[in-house]
């Protein structure tokens, strides 16, 4: 039977998870390398397409699942493969940090990717000033 609950990841939830896994970390996933991506081409799907190739790394599993859920909501989900930079690889932690920076920018400037994001927009200034207080 269908669930009476249909959650989708909110931007604040994704931001918090990205902060949690990068805070005080010099590396992630044993320094695994992934393809660099153009996040402006659809940040959730682009990031997912790169990170999905990282296996056996529990630290990013929750992020991967959030991105998968967010990407599946996007009508143009299949149009981002050509945007990947095939000649540049970066460490997982760098991609995640890039994503965090980009998500914060999207959040601040109102380039919303979903209905839930609209309701969270008013909170961006708080996030920018308090993200270092997040618990682990």
């Amino acid at each position: 039977s269908p669930s009476p609950v249909t959650p989708s990841p909110t931007l604040k939830e994704l931001i918090e998870e990205l902060v949690n896994i990068t805070q005080n970390q010099a590396s992630l996933c044993n320094g695994s390398m992934v393809w660099s991506v153009n996040l402006t081409a659809g940040m959730y799907c682009a990031a997912l397409e790169s990170l999905i190739n990282v296996s056996d790394c529990s630290a990013i599993q929750r992020t991967q699942r959030m991105l998968k859920a967010l990407c599946s909501q996007k009508p143009a989900a299949g149009q981002i493969s050509s945007e990947r930079s095939r000649d540049t690889k970066i460490e997982v932690i760098q991609l995640v940090k890039n994503l965090l920076t980009y998500v914060r920018g999207v959040y601040r400037h109102g380039n919303f990717r979903g209905l839930n994001d609209i309701f969270e927009a008013q909170k961006i200034e708080w996030h920018e000033h308090h993200h270092h207080h997040h618990h682990h």
């Epitope: 039977s1 669930s3 009476p4 609950v5 249909t6 959650p7 990841p9 909110t10 604040k12 939830e13 931001i15 918090e16 529990s58 599993q61 929750r62 699942r65 959030m66 998968k68 859920a69 839930n116 309701f119 909170k123 708080w126 996030h127 308090h130 993200h131 207080h133 997040h134 618990h135 682990h136």
Partner: antibody, heavy 120, light 107 residues
Framework: EVQLVESGGDSVRPGGSLRLSCVAS????????MGWVRQAPGKGLQWVAW????????SYADAVKGRFTISRDNAKDTLYLQMDDLRVDDTAVYYC?????????????WGQGTLVTVSS | SYVLTQPPSVTVPLRQTARISCGGD??????VHWYQQKPGQAPVLIIY???NRPTGIPERFSGSNSGNMATLTIRGALAEDEADYYC?????????FGSGTQLTVLG
Amino acid sequence: EVQLVESGGDSVRPGGSLRLSCVASGFTFSRYNMGWVRQAPGKGLQWVAWIYDGGSRTSYADAVKGRFTISRDNAKDTLYLQMDDLRVDDTAVYYCARDPSSWGSLFDYWGQGTLVTVSS
Amino acid sequence: SYVLTQPPSVTVPLRQTARISCGGDNIRSKNVHWYQQKPGQAPVLIIYQDSNRPTGIPERFSGSNSGNMATLTIRGALAEDEADYYCQVWANDGYVFGSGTQLTVLG
């Protein structure tokens, strides 16, 4: 109709072991993260453990880490909680619960619980 | 570890508005969920992701989350709303529950 039915609760001495089971029906069990939550008599809810849909990741509350093991058999639509080195303060009703998010966030359906009593 | 603080009890007259608070450090950055539990029964999800109501939950239940406080509001509380209420967030790689609030409806 979604149903979660726990079993395996019993009275046991401190240091003993128990294995709880939770049989799921009414939904595709293999697509959902699952968890265990307990409630000591007259007390509040305390999360115990969770497991991803395919079993690829687990996590435990500090109070049970190293003593309890959560697992699942998707072919049998069953969730398990192996409880070893039981202590008096593990006495509680243990609920099996389903998380409707794929990433881990909340519980939307709960079983009716099974009582575990640890006493000397 | 992350701690959610709730008042032990809240009392409200019949058909008046009850508000149950849930405090946590920067709770605004988290999605807050609320459960209702009646004696001898399993908990029931009544609000998820701060303010969303699951199918079948009456409109008198609503939720909000701002500052360091999330709030469950019951407008026009009924006798059947007498129960324990728990807030919950995701933190520390797991599900964190508040200590619970016992709601009493007078009249």
